[in-house]
């Protein structure tokens, strides 16, 4: 990480993207270790903010404003040079959010997919956007940009992620921004999951009393497995959203959830997964798909006395 | 469509405040900020500035720092211009215009001021 | 402040002709420019931005072109109705700064 020839290293944390009102640590890494330094805001000017003043190891910045958006450098303490301090380092771009309303983020064709496959993210807003831009939560880098098209009063980038690996999984956001202040962004876009399957062996899917019921009566899906899954998750063919249980070790060593569908009243194709906590948005393959029968009067829904998961969320851990 | 109107002319003596209204409609008011345009008789024109109308944070270019004031009725999708403490060379045609490139204009607002 | 001149300052054309205006950026401005059509009495009226993106409505005997520093403005074929003044707008960099502005009129 360390900037070549005498140049320090400008680091954020947790992130280069903060929130109007947040906080960001700037640290300046210099000759394997963090010295005193100065900051440098380039506006046009080149001066350096903050009066000259000189800080210890990082300089927490905040809350933020708009104003804060931009570029920095810092400068490390070198005491015997010429000037006393170190070339400039890399420029560090930060990113101030909240400033328009805020565009929508889907997935294409769709956010669970298969470890290789390719994903789009479509980030699109009826606010003529100049840039998009797409950030994976808990990653510092600068998230990716791209110039927004316009099209039929909609402005929209996609981004095209893969082929996917675990470290591609995750929760997603986009922002958009204007052209004269390109790092005021947007507020951010709903949270998209996106969760990479077919990593570790699939779990077994069963029905209780069976597969095939009658009307009202109470049906409930287990899912299990011999691996140690933390997490199994069940989607419905059909249904944008997944439910997700807490796995529990049974006497005969297997790990399972047992969903509670309720009084049957309208069949469908039913499918697990399993998980891990340490990577929450990485799944198993599929359990083989289970069809659910109802015989009698099948209704056009089905009640869920297990709460659904929200759009997001598969990538935060069970509490 | 997308529409801007503002408020009818005014004559002012030197000294006293204006407020000019823009009410947009056609669009959701808060996507687009709101920047004002000045123009004197046989001038060319002057950006003053812009209001984040989803934030209502100002920006006031710098000859018109201090007695200028931009601010927003959001419930009414209505922008502000307000001039105090007046003087003879604020006699212009103002103008609201929407938008990061300036896409739809109102129709002006003469302010005369003279003793 | 970024500085932008246009030019002529008012020139005169006959119908039919074609008419070019240009604008000149003090410094680097990427695509950021837009361009204006007033007439007395009336909200001015936007034809391009971005350059060279037509505003929807606008007849396509307007173009723009340009990037970086240097813009233009053509109307292809001169019509009565376009008479006026034209200006640029940079709007790359806060404050945004209009051009002096085009006079055109009819011969």
């Known amino acids: 990480l360390m900037g070549g020839q005498d140049k320090p290293f400008l680091s954020a944390r947790p992130s280069t993207v903060v929130p109007r009102g947040g906080h960001v640590a700037l640290q300046c890494h210099y000759r394997r270790g963090f010295n005193n330094f100065m900051l440098y805001k380039e506006d046009r000017s080149h001066v350096p903010i903050f009066h000259g003043r000189i800080f210890q190891e990082s300089f927490i910045m905040g809350p933020v404003t708009p104003a804060h958006a931009g570029t920095y450098r810092c400068r490390g303490s070198r005491p015997h040079s010429l000037t006393g301090w170190s070339a400039p380092s890399n420029p560090l771009v930060i990113m101030v959010t909240g400033n328009h309303r805020k565009p929508s983020l889907l997935a294409h064709p769709g956010p669970l997919l298969k470890s290789g496959e390719t994903v789009i993210l479509q980030c699109w807003s009826d606010i003529m956007f100049e840039h998009f831009f797409l950030h994976r939560e808990g990653i510092s880098e600068d998230p990716s940009r791209l110039v927004g098209q316009i099209h039929d009063g909609v402005s929209k980038a996609n981004f095209s992620i893969g082929p996917l690996m675990p470290v591609l999984a995750g929760t997603y956001r986009c922002y958009g921004s204007v052209p004269h202040s390109p790092y005021q962004l947007s507020a951010p876009s709903d949270p998209l999951d996106i969760v990479i399957t077919g990593l570790y062996e699939k779990p077994s899917l069963s029905a209780q009393p069976g597969p095939t019921v009658q009307a009202g009566e109470n049906v409930t899906l287990s899912c299990s497995s011999w691996s140690s899954y933390d997490i199994y998750h069940l989607s419905r063919e059909g249904e944008a959203h997944e439910r997700r249980l807490r796995a529990v070790p049974k006497v005969n060593r297997t790990f399972q959830a047992d969903f509670p569908l309720g009084p049957a009243t309208h069949g469908g194709t039913y499918r697990c997964f399993g998980s891990f906590r340490a990577l929450p948005c990485v799944w198993s393959n599929s359990s083989d798909p289970l069809l659910v029968s109802v015989t009698g009067n099948p209704s056009s829904s089905w009640p869920s006395p297990t709460e659904p998961s929200s759009k997001s969320g598969i990538c935060r851990h069970l509490h | 469509q997308i529409q801007l109107v503002q408020s009818g002319p005014e004559l002012k003596n030197p000294g006293e405040t204006v407020k000019i209204s823009c009410k947009a409609s056609?669009?959701?008011?808060?996507?687009?900020?709101m920047n004002w345009v000045k123009q004197a008789p046989g001038k060319g024109l002057k950006w003053m500035g812009w209001?984040?109308?989803?934030?209502?944070?100002?920006t006031y270019a710098d000859d018109f720092k201090g007695r200028f004031a931009f601010s927003l009725e959001t419930s009414a999708s209505t922008a502000y211009l307000q001039i105090n403490n007046l003087k003879n060379e604020d006699t212009a045609t103002y103008f609201c215009?929407?938008?990061?490139?300036?896409?739809?204009w109102g129709q002006g607002t003469l302010v005369t001021v003279s003793t | 402040d970024i500085k932008m001149t246009q030019s002529p300052s008012s020139m005169y054309a006959s119908l039919g002709e074609r008419v070019t205006i240009t604008c000149k950026a003090s410094?680097?401005?990427?695509?950021?420019l837009s361009w204006f059509q007033l007439k007395p009495g009336k909200s001015p009226k936007t034809l391009i931005y971005?350059?060279?993106r037509l505003v929807d409505g606008v007849p396509s005997r307007f173009s723009g072109s340009g990037s970086g520093q240097d813009f233009s403005l053509t109307i292809s074929s001169l019509e009565c109705e376009d008479m006026g003044i034209y200006y640029c707008?940079?709007?790359?960099?806060?404050?945004?700064?209009f051009g002096g502005g085009t006079t055109l009129e009819i011969k």
């Open positions: 215009a929407h938008g990061p490139w300036l896409a739809y």
């Open positions: 056609g669009y959701i008011f808060t996507n687009y900020g």
């Open positions: 209001i984040n109308t989803y934030t209502g944070e100002p």
């Open positions: 410094q680097d401005i990427n695509s950021y």
């Open positions: 971005r350059a060279n």
């Open positions: 707008l940079q709007y790359d960099e806060l404050p945004y700064t």
